[in-house]
């Protein structure tokens, strides 16, 4: 199709090198067609205009979205040619950052159902850079955190260096929504609930004498609880001893509880006592069974490919921590009878 | 008197295949006992090959053995070692060798091996 | 996978002499470790399993010791019997299953 008609935007995305980020684009459909399809600013049935030039699906993935390539060549489709591009609706994620993003990305409905929708598409320009000015030691991070039942604040990264006065106007949306009454540099939450949570998305225009773009950046957002103040508790194993069958395999699992911790470095492992020796063992890998606001519990593994005489005197001990404390339990094997 | 016997062993040309053979006599392959493959290259030291649980029937291979060789319980009392692709490197005495059954894996009981020579 | 380093790789020692065989893996595979005997055109014989216990028939000249991942065999009061290749062996369990060997050691008997 002819992209010559699309509205075109300039976005400029300067990433840490230091740190991981996603980055996305909506597909921001001129008004009024943007609304009506993207249900961005849903409007009622009573309410759409009764000649809208572009009468667009109610379906949310109904976009379709493309990259042209530098050398001319013909318009690619994300999904077949981009494994580390996802469209989630009418947004793009980008998951890695790096130079390599950079490029013209084209949306446009893929249901065209009048002449009029053949110019219904956005064309962005995205230029990806890599942060260089080091003047900005402090920069606020894509990652945030806010905790639940206080006071707190989501700062835009790419202006969290600059005074709210000299802040140019920010355009904020969240999980991809407007936040219309948010115009600063920095939302600040007087009291931090779970919906707080989310994608949070922040977009300011620069200009030169040529032309403007948008800085846009994208801040990972999740509420937590305080750091806990217990060690990691066992829950199974909770008896000490166990009974096998001599000659059969055996797996004896270890499930702990961890309370959150902002910096979360969890251990849990397995180790063997014979008599007076000690060593541990090399098991699968742990991993999470639960994970809530408060705790996580985690399970790993111990595989005796077959019971031994020689396992029945030895104990296997189950040891976790975090950075409280640590915690232990042991099971001694038991043959069973009969 | 329990022992075991290898077979099957002999001349193969390089890329071929070849299946050794190890029979059980004065005892059957009870669940606990595990039979395994071990070669010895001539004035070489030994290699484990593989291992299999004679009861679950789960296996075990060295690293370098996984894909070219298969190990099986085809009765109660033989396991074979199928090899294919052999070369020059394969040319060695295979043992096979039984554990201590619920005693540990330590190899109790060893046949006295076949030979196997990859050369064209 | 376990790497099991045995040194050295051949020792001469007298009648009524004593040999000592070092054994390194390389992780600590705690006491599961065998040692056994081959004598040319023979199949090896175990000796020693868990690191330290005697396998039977075999006589108390032989000494196992150590264990996560330093072992030693020691062999007292040699007798021209005892002439051979000794390997050791790391049968350890934890993720899979591990039985490299050694790469043996030749006693000769002066």
């Known amino acids: 199709f002819n992209i010559s008609g699309c509205s075109t935007k300039k976005l400029l995305w300067t990433y840490s090198t230091r740190s991981e980020e996603e980055f996305v684009l909506f597909c921001d459909l001129p008004e009024p067609q943007k609304s009506h399809f993207c249900h961005r600013n849903r409007l009622s049935p009573k309410q759409v205009p009764e000649h809208l030039p572009f009468m667009g699906s109610n379906d949310l993935s109904d976009v379709q979205w493309y990259q042209q390539p530098s050398n001319g060549d013909p318009l690619e489709d994300i999904r077949k040619s981009y494994p580390h591009i996802i469209q989630d609706k009418c947004t793009l994620h980008f998951l890695t950052p790096g130079v390599n993003n950079s490029g013209s990305y084209i949306c446009r409905p893929k249901m065209i159902k009048s002449p009029y929708d053949v110019a219904c598409c956005v064309k962005m320009i995205l230029e990806v850079k890599p942060q260089t000015n080091a003047s900005c030691e402090y920069s606020a991070s894509h990652k945030q955190d806010l905790l639940l039942g206080s006071t707190g604040s989501i700062s835009c990264p790419s202006l969290s260096c600059q005074s709210d006065a000299q802040s140019p106007a920010v355009t904020w949306y969240k999980n991809g929504k407007l936040l219309s009454v948010e115009r600063s540099n920095r939302i600040v939450v007087d009291e931090v609930y779970d919906y707080h949570q989310g994608t949070y998305v922040c977009d300011y225009t620069q200009s030169d004498t040529v032309s403007s773009w948008t800085v846009r950046a994208v801040v990972q957002v999740r509420t937590i609880v305080g750091d806990t103040k217990l060690k990691p508790d066992i829950l199974d194993p909770v008896e000490d001893t166990l009974e096998v069958e001599l000659g059969k395999p055996l797996t004896i699992s270890c499930k702990a509880r961890f309370g959150f911790e902002r910096v979360f470095n969890p251990v849990i492992k397995w180790y063997i006592k014979d008599s007076d020796l000690e060593w541990e063992v090399s098991v699968p890998e742990a991993k999470s069974i639960k994970s809530t606001l408060k705790d996580e519990i985690i399970e790993r593994n111990i595989i005796l490919e077959k019971v031994t005489q020689r396992d029945l005197r030895r104990k296997f001990v189950c040891f976790v921590q975090n950075s409280i404390g640590n915690t232990t339990q042991s099971v001694q094997l038991k043959e069973k009878r009969g | 008197q329990e022992q075991l016997e290898e077979s099957g062993g002999g001349l193969v040309q390089p890329e071929g295949s070849l299946t050794l053979t190890c029979t059980a006599s004065g005892f059957s392959f009870s669940s606990s006992y595990w039979i395994c493959w071990v070669r010895q290259a001539p004035g070489k030291g030994l290699e484990w090959i593989a291992c299999i649980a004679a009861g679950s029937g789960s296996t075990y291979y060295a690293s370098w053995a996984k894909g070219r060789f298969t190990i099986s319980k085809t009765s109660s009392t033989t396991v074979t070692l199928q090899m294919t692709s052999l070369t020059a490197a394969d040319t060695a005495t295979y043992f096979c060798?039984?554990?201590?059954?619920?005693?540990?894996?330590?190899?109790?009981?060893w046949g006295p091996g076949t030979l196997v020579t990859v050369s064209s | 996978d376990v790497v099991m380093t045995q040194t050295p790789a051949s020792v001469s020692e007298p009648v009524g002499g004593t040999v000592t065989i070092k054994c390194q893996a390389s992780q600590n595979i705690g006491n599961n470790l065998a040692w056994y005997q081959q004598k040319p055109g023979q199949p090896p014989k175990l000796l020693i399993d868990y690191a330290s216990t005697l396998a039977s028939g075999v006589p108390s000249r032989f000494k196992g010791s150590g264990s996560g991942t330093q072992f030693t065999l020691a062999i007292s009061d040699l007798d021209c019997a005892d002439a051979a290749t000794y390997y050791c062996?790391?049968?350890?369990?934890?993720?899979?299953?591990?039985?490299?060997f050694g790469g043996g050691t030749e006693v000769v008997v002066k």
């Open positions: 060798a039984r554990d201590l059954g619920d005693d540990g894996y330590a190899y109790g009981l």
């Open positions: 062996q790391c049968t350890f369990y934890g993720s899979g299953y591990v039985a490299a």
